[in-house]
Interface confidence: low
């Protein structure tokens, strides 16, 4: 019997260059005659073109819905009834090749052709992409408000704001043809539901989406997206009502920058250097396509390339890569947005050097990726640390912290977290090592005090790069380091002279001199500590809320004791920056670190003073009794407390808290309490923090009041932010 | 300094309850949890409970649990454990001894000697 | 209940000799071991807690190490008070057990 061919409706989107015609202002405002009449005669050239070809038993219908310059570019979108065995056989390649055809069969030919009555066409500015109905459907949505601009060489435009009162709106923006389109978003306000996309073309092609943002982020509060080349779209769709743009968008053109670069690197380790994709941090763009070629000196070496929050990960079934790919030494790697660092070790065996290549293999782009490099020595790539395969990195072994997502730092220790004697392994304390007294059967703790040692876990490191042995030496009145360095920066952790905290006691004035309160509008949300002249340190799970984002909600309140009223001792500033550690995760609490800068600096004095940061190898040792303070919850669901309270915990081993909270502990965390309970954190006193006293009598911030279960819970400890994980982040921020 | 000071030795009947004090000086009880372990003659340390003075909280081991009770007096500043239901197999010196929280038992009773016979 | 099992059971050895005592619990303590000393006659005495800590008064010659479920108590120069039985004891998890006992006697 006769079956009824099956027909697909297959869209297709353009453009096409007309030479004879110029472009004009009327020809952006789709209300106005000359856009009417434009429209209608480009229209009818466009049917008549695809009718002239073999595509015309299946044409459907078609439309011109804007314009540009170049003299005249037409950009439209036409759809073709197809059988559907035939689908694949016109792809957008074939309908463009079919359609050049046809234009230049008739580029010398004086016989009169319907689509050349009024329309010179170029054929090399001819161009087709596939579509769905789906996009013609966003398309229209957005007609209503459809904003063309063209931005000249060395110009930086300005586009004017959404119009409020219409749902979505499109700004199509073209630059002069060899150069590439950059465009600035600023988010302005602090919390919205706008919606942004950009695409690689004229219209909203889900296809050829290079990225789509969302909701006024805080993490990127200003993106910076390039197109491969001189066209882009980017549609807004609205969020909640406002008379404000939240967000300001700029356009400018700029020239292809090349990403192809060959280096010989030094003889020494550590980074050298930089490589990134162009106009980093910029989203690099759609048609990415690096090639760095490095030479390394000698086969002692391999190359390192340390990554900030991107990874790369073999990628099963030659799936396309997402986030750009990586061909290195002929092996295919993805890259992965990851809120953790990486390192990628690549060994040498040949002396011809290693050639990288990255590539964005789909339109859809993410942040310029950005990768130090720099050379390792095979036999030995972690001094004194664990290479930890997962990701690359050296970390500290045997420190009692699983650093290492697969514990291996951890394993085969002789001694965890203590001191290896030479003669015969046993294993001593670390306050016992350089102490002046020998625990080691020879004495070998008290070995070589005095002079520089290989770095590892538990050394510390000078700011001439040597080590010294003996643990935590900072600021202890006695210079263990030959440029002294130990014994810098030194004013702080002394307490003042004085006479959410479960279980505690009623602090004094001047007790806790680094101490702060954060407020908004006059309530205290969270406690934090004075760190450097304009430094206060918090937790970043304060700022969780979109409401609590703004540096103008805050105030920060020093030397204070009683929320209810003022003392002379007492001082308040603004905020002026709000920087949350980028690694910072929500969910799993992860780099729960915030940094406060204030608005002018502190005065020291007995009430305000900044506590002591420890250095990355500094050792909190478990069992330590140490201290919190805040002005959190008396009792679990309780109102905050009135005067700063204190209460003394004891510091519990890693592995011992991860077990009880099921393995959520990860190494930037440290938890504190007693299995008993009692003695916790509460609400409102996140980001305050948790200090030990050193021997010198200087207090050191250890952790931060992050989170837990409950208050005060049997069984359940505090849960800190582990000062000594983030450390090398605040250093970085503060100096 | 830190001292626990036992009650007497005694000598009991099978089915009997015994009741051991243990008087801590120089420390404040509630800042510690108060554990009994035992020792029968010859054989390893046994734990058998301890108590939170501070809430009277208590946990005992499944294996002495429905027959002990430890009790706290704040104010004397002294702890107690009662075993009851007595049978031969419970002779042993029955020690109490503190710890604070997490750690383990620090100072220790000088021992009270329980002989159950008939 | 996690059983803790100590080896030797007895040890003979001399003054100044270096001992080691070893002790295994059936399940992960982490690092929650403490080791004690007991004399006929005396109650025990603190000498290691988390693993490797000296209690405070305790002679430098008495270390401590491992984690998980293996356990080293380790004399590095025996001195004549030394001889006695030495326990070791997981506070990890109540009911909290100790194992059987190292006799450790003079030679």
């Known amino acids: 019997g006769y079956k009824a061919e099956v027909m697909v409706s297959q869209v297709y989107s353009g453009s096409l260059r007309v030479l004879n015609r110029h472009f004009s202002q009327d020809l952006t405002r789709r209300e106005s005659s000359a856009f009417r009449s434009e429209t209608a005669k480009a229209q009818k050239m466009l049917k008549e073109l695809i009718t002239s070809t073999r595509l015309g038993t299946y044409y459907n219908s078609s439309s011109v819905y804007s314009f540009g310059e170049g003299p005249l570019t037409c950009f439209f979108w036409f759809i073709l009834q197809i059988p559907e065995h035939r689908r694949l056989m016109l792809s957008p390649e074939v309908v463009q090749a079919l359609l050049v055809e046809e234009l230049l069969s008739t580029v010398n030919s004086s016989a009169a052709v319907p689509y050349r009555a009024e329309y010179e066409v170029d054929p090399e500015g001819l161009v087709i992409l596939e579509a769905s109905v789906k996009d013609i459907a966003a398309l229209n949505s957005t007609l209503g408000c459809y904003r063309y601009s063209y931005v000249g060489q060395g110009q930086v435009l300005r586009l004017k704001g959404p119009d409020h009162l219409a749902s979505s709106c499109l700004w199509h923006l073209q630059g002069p043809k060899d150069l590439m389109l950059k465009l600035r978003l600023e988010w302005t306000l602090a919390e919205c539901r706008d919606r942004l996309a950009m695409y690689d073309v004229a219209g909203p092609l889900e296809k050829r989406l290079i990225t789509s943002v969302y909701g006024c982020s805080r993490q990127e509060p200003v993106v910076e997206v390039l197109a491969s080349g001189a066209i882009m779209a980017v549609v807004w769709k609205k969020g909640l009502h406002s008379y404000y743009d939240p967000f300001v968008l700029s356009v400018q053109p700029v020239v292809f920058q090349a990403c192809e670069v060959n280096l010989t690197l030094d003889n020494r380790l550590d980074s050298q250097g930089v490589l990134s994709t162009p106009y980093f941090p910029s989203y690099y763009s759609p048609q990415t396509h690096c090639s760095w070629h490095l030479t390394v000196p000698s086969l002692d070496y391999g190359l390192a390339l340390w990554f900030d929050a991107y990874a790369l990960r073999r990628q099963k079934y030659d799936l396309p890569c997402t986030q750009g790919q990586w061909t290195i030494q002929n092996r295919r790697l993805c890259g992965l947005r990851i809120l953790q660092p990486y390192a990628e070790r690549i060994p040498v065996v040949a002396t011809a050097g290693i050639t990288i290549n990255f590539t964005s293999q789909i339109s859809l782009t993410g942040p310029g990726v950005r990768v130090h490099y720099g050379l390792y020595n095979q036999s030995d790539p972690c001094p004194g640390e664990f290479l930890c395969s997962v990701n690359g990195l050296c970390v500290p072994a045997c420190d009692g912290v699983k650093d290492c997502p697969n514990g291996l730092d951890e394993r085969n220790c002789v001694c965890r977290a203590t001191f290896q004697c030479k003669e015969d392994s046993t294993c001593i304390s670390l306050p016992k090592v350089c102490d002046g007294q020998p625990d080691c059967l020879n004495g070998s703790d008290e070995e070589q005090c005095q002079e520089g040692v290989p770095c590892g876990t538990f050394t510390f490191q000078c700011e001439d790069r040597s080590c010294v042995k003996k643990p935590n030496p900072q600021c202890d009145g006695r210079p263990d380091c030959r440029d002294g360095s130990d014994e810098e920066h030194c004013d702080c952790g002394l307490q003042g002279p004085s006479s959410r905290i479960v279980g505690g006691a009623v602090s004094s004035e001047g007790e806790w001199p680094w101490q702060a309160s954060l407020q908004v509008r006059g309530r205290h949300i969270c406690g934090g500590a004075l760190i450097a002249d304009r430094w206060v340190i918090t937790a970043a799970h304060c700022f969780q809320e979109d409401s609590m984002a703004s540096t103008v909600l805050w105030t920060v309140f020093l030397g204070k004791v009683w929320q209810n009223s003022r003392w002379p001792g007492e001082v308040s500033f603004k905020v002026s920056r709000l920087l949350l550690h980028p690694y910072h995760e929500e969910d799993s609490h992860d780099y729960d670190v915030a940094l406060l800068q204030l608005d002018h600096p502190v005065v020291r004095s007995a009430a305000v003073r900044p506590v002591c940061l420890p250095a990355r190898s500094h050792f909190f040792e478990p069992g330590l009794h140490c201290w919190i303070t805040g002005w959190g919850a008396l009792r679990e669901g309780g109102p905050i407390s009135n005067a700063l309270q204190k209460v003394d915990v004891q510091l519990i081993p890693q592995d011992l808290c991860s077990e009880v909270y099921r393995y959520q502990v990860t190494p930037r965390m440290l938890c504190a309490g007693y299995r008993k309970g009692k003695k916790d954190a509460c609400q409102g006193d996140s980001g305050g923090p948790l200090v030990c006293k050193a021997l010198s009598g200087r207090w050191f911030l250890a952790g931060l009041v992050s989170w837990g279960l409950g208050c005060g819970r049997p069984n359940y400890f505090g849960v800190y932010t582990r000062i000594t994980g983030v450390i090398s982040w605040i250093q970085q921020v503060v100096t | 300094q830190v001292q626990l000071v036992q009650s007497g030795a005694e000598v009991k009947k099978p089915g009997a309850s015994v009741k051991v004090s243990c008087k801590a000086s120089?420390?404040?009880?509630?800042?510690?949890?108060m554990h009994w372990v035992r020792q029968a003659p010859g054989q390893r340390l046994e734990w058998m409970g301890r108590i939170d003075p501070e809430d009277a909280e208590t946990t005992y081991s499944p294996k002495f649990q429905g027959r002990v009770t430890i009790i706290p007096d704040t104010s004397a500043n002294t702890a107690y454990m009662e075993l009851s239901s007595l049978r031969s197999e419970d002779t042993a010196v029955y020690y109490c001894?503190?710890?604070?929280?997490?750690?383990?038992?620090?100072?220790w009773g000088q021992g009270t000697l329980v002989t159950v016979s008939s | 209940d996690i059983q803790m099992t100590q080896s030797p059971k007895s040890l003979s050895a001399s003054v100044g000799d270096r001992v080691t005592i070893t002790c295994r619990a059936s399940?992960?303590?982490?690092?929650?071991l403490a080791w004690y000393q007991q004399k006929p006659g005396q109650s025990p005495k603190l000498l290691i807690y988390?693993?490797?800590t000296r209690h405070s008064g305790v002679p430098s010659r008495f270390s401590g190490s491992g984690s998980g479920t293996d356990f080293t108590l380790t004399i590095s120069s025996l001195q004549p008070e030394d001889f006695a039985t030495y326990y070791c004891q997981q506070h990890y998890s109540t009911p909290y057990t100790f194992g059987q006992g190292t006799k450790l006697e003079i030679k």
């Open positions: 120089g420390f404040n009880i509630e800042d510690y949890y």
């Open positions: 399940q992960d303590v982490t690092t929650a």
């Open positions: 988390w693993a490797t």
């Open positions: 001894a503190r710890s604070i929280y997490l750690d383990p038992m620090d100072y």
